[in-house]
Interface confidence: medium
C-alpha cells in the first residue's frame, strides 16, 4: 500500500520567539528516500528541513529518526519570527539512482500563525 | 452565541434530487472549516463532507463521492449540501459540524434535518 | 481508514454508578481522539479532545483517558441527564474522518 503522509494539525498558533513543534508520521519508510519539510507551494516553496544530516539552524528534529522503524518525523522550530508565518508541508520522496529523488506524498499542511509577543 | 440551524430536509423520491442549507452566526464563518455529518434512524453518526473555511479543500464519504456536493457562500454565512441521485439508504438526519480551528474534531453542532428517500 | 470499535454497545446502569465507555482504533491516532455525548433530538455535544481535556462547560465528573490505539470515558457517578448514546471520532488521520458506532447509556 502506498506511504501515507500525516500531519495531524490544521494549523498552529506561537508568540515570537517561542518554539513550536510541526507533527508528521509516516506509515511507511518504504520506498527509500528522505523526508523533507517545506513552507509554501509551487515555485515559492522554500525547503525549511531535510532529514538528511544537514544542519538547519533553529529547526531540529523532535525524535531520534536513526532508530529502526522510526515513523515519526516531526520538527521543534525555535526562536521564530514573523518571517516564519506560512504553511509547512512533510514530504515524502522516493530516491532516485541517477536522476533526482521523486516526491511521492506530501501532508495537508500545517499552518503556523505568529503572534506578536 | 455560536449558531448552525439546517434547513432543506423533506421527503424525496430515489433518484431524485435535494439542497440542504446550513445558516451560521455568532463566529467568523469564513475562518472555519465545516462538515456535513448524517444519522440515519437507529444507526451512529456517519461524516459526509467537509469544505475548508475558503471552500478549496474539499472532501467526500466514498458512500456520497459523485452525487453530492458541498458548497459554501462567505458573503452569506451559509453551507450548502447538494444531494443528487439520492438513494433510501441517505434517509438520515443531516447535520452540519463546525470544526474547530486547530483540529478536525467538531466543536458546534446544529440540530439537523430530516432526509427522507422513499417512494 | 481507521476504523474504531466501541464497547459495550449498551451500558445499564443506576444513576450514582461509575460507567466505562472504551473505544479502540483500528490503528495508532496518538491522542486525537474526540468523545460526544448525543440525546434523542438533540445535537451531539462535545465532551473531549486530545482524549483527555473536557470541552468548555463539561462537568468534572467526565474524563477521558488513553493513546495510540485504546481510549476510555469514563463517567465518575452518572446523573440522570447523563443516559445517552456516547460516540469517539478520531481526527488523526485525513478524513475520512469516523466515528466508532457509540455506547448507549440507559438506566437500569
Known amino acids: 500500500t502506498e506511504v501515507k503522509v500525516t500531519q495531524p494539525e490544521k494549523s498552529v498558533s506561537v508568540a515570537a520567539g517561542d518554539s513550536t513543534i510541526l507533527n508528521c508520521t509516516v506509515t511507511s519508510l518504504l520506498p527509500v528516500g528522505p523526508i523533507r519539510w517545506y513552507r509554501g507551494v509551487g515555485q515559492s516553496r522554500l525547503l525549511i528541513y531535510s532529514f538528511t544530516g544537514e544542519h538547519f539552524p533553529r529547526i531540529r528534529n523532535v525524535s531520534d529518526t536513526t532508530k529502526r522503524n522510526n515513523m515519526d518525523f516531526s520538527i521543534r522550530i525555535s526562536n521564530v519570527t514573523p518571517e516564519d508565518a506560512g504553511t509547512y508541508y512533510c514530504v515524502k520522496f522516493q530516491r532516485g539512482s541517477s536522476e533526482p529523488d521523486t516526491e511521492i506524498q506530501s501532508g495537508g499542511g500545517t499552518e503556523v500563525y505568529v503572534l506578536a509577543k | 452565541e455560536v449558531q448552525l440551524v439546517e434547513s432543506g430536509g423533506g421527503v424525496v423520491q430515489p433518484g431524485r434530487s435535494l439542497r440542504l442549507s446550513c445558516a451560521a452566526s455568532?463566529?467568523?464563518?469564513?475562518?472555519?472549516?465545516v462538515n456535513w455529518v448524517r444519522q440515519a434512524p437507529g444507526k451512529g453518526l456517519e461524516w459526509v463532507s467537509l469544505?475548508?473555511?475558503?471552500?478549496?479543500?474539499?472532501y467526500y464519504a466514498d458512500s456520497v463521492k459523485g452525487r453530492f456536493t458541498i458548497s459554501r457562500d462567505n458573503s452569506k454565512n451559509t453551507l450548502y449540501l447538494q444531494m443528487n441521485s439520492l438513494r433510501a439508504e441517505d434517509t438520515a438526519v443531516y447535520y452540519c459540524?463546525?470544526?474547530?480551528?486547530?483540529?478536525?474534531?467538531?466543536?458546534?453542532w446544529g440540530q439537523g434535518t430530516l432526509v427522507t428517500v422513499s417512494s | 481508514e481507521t476504523v474504531l470499535t466501541q464497547s459495550p454497545g449498551t451500558l445499564t446502569l443506576s444513576p450514582g454508578e461509575r460507567a466505562t465507555l472504551t473505544c479502540r482504533a483500528s490503528?495508532?491516532?496518538?491522542?486525537?481522539l474526540a468523545w460526544y455525548q448525543e440525546k434523542p433530538g438533540q445535537a451531539p455535544r462535545l465532551l473531549i479532545y486530545g482524549a483527555s481535556s473536557r470541552a468548555t462547560g463539561i462537568p468534572d465528573r467526565f474524563s477521558g483517558s488513553g493513546s495510540g490505539t485504546e481510549f476510555t470515558l469514563t463517567i465518575s457517578s452518572l446523573q440522570s441527564e447523563d443516559f445517552a448514546v456516547y460516540y469517539c471520532q478520531q481526527y488523526y488521520d485525513r478524513p475520512p474522518l469516523t466515528f466508532g458506532g457509540g455506547t448507549k447509556v440507559e438506566i437500569k
Open positions: 459540524a463546525k470544526e474547530n480551528n486547530r483540529y478536525r474534531f467538531f466543536d458546534d
Open positions: 469544505i475548508s473555511g475558503s471552500g478549496e479543500i474539499i
Open positions: 455568532g463566529f467568523t464563518f469564513s475562518s472555519y472549516d
Open positions: 490503528q495508532s491516532v496518538y491522542t486525537y
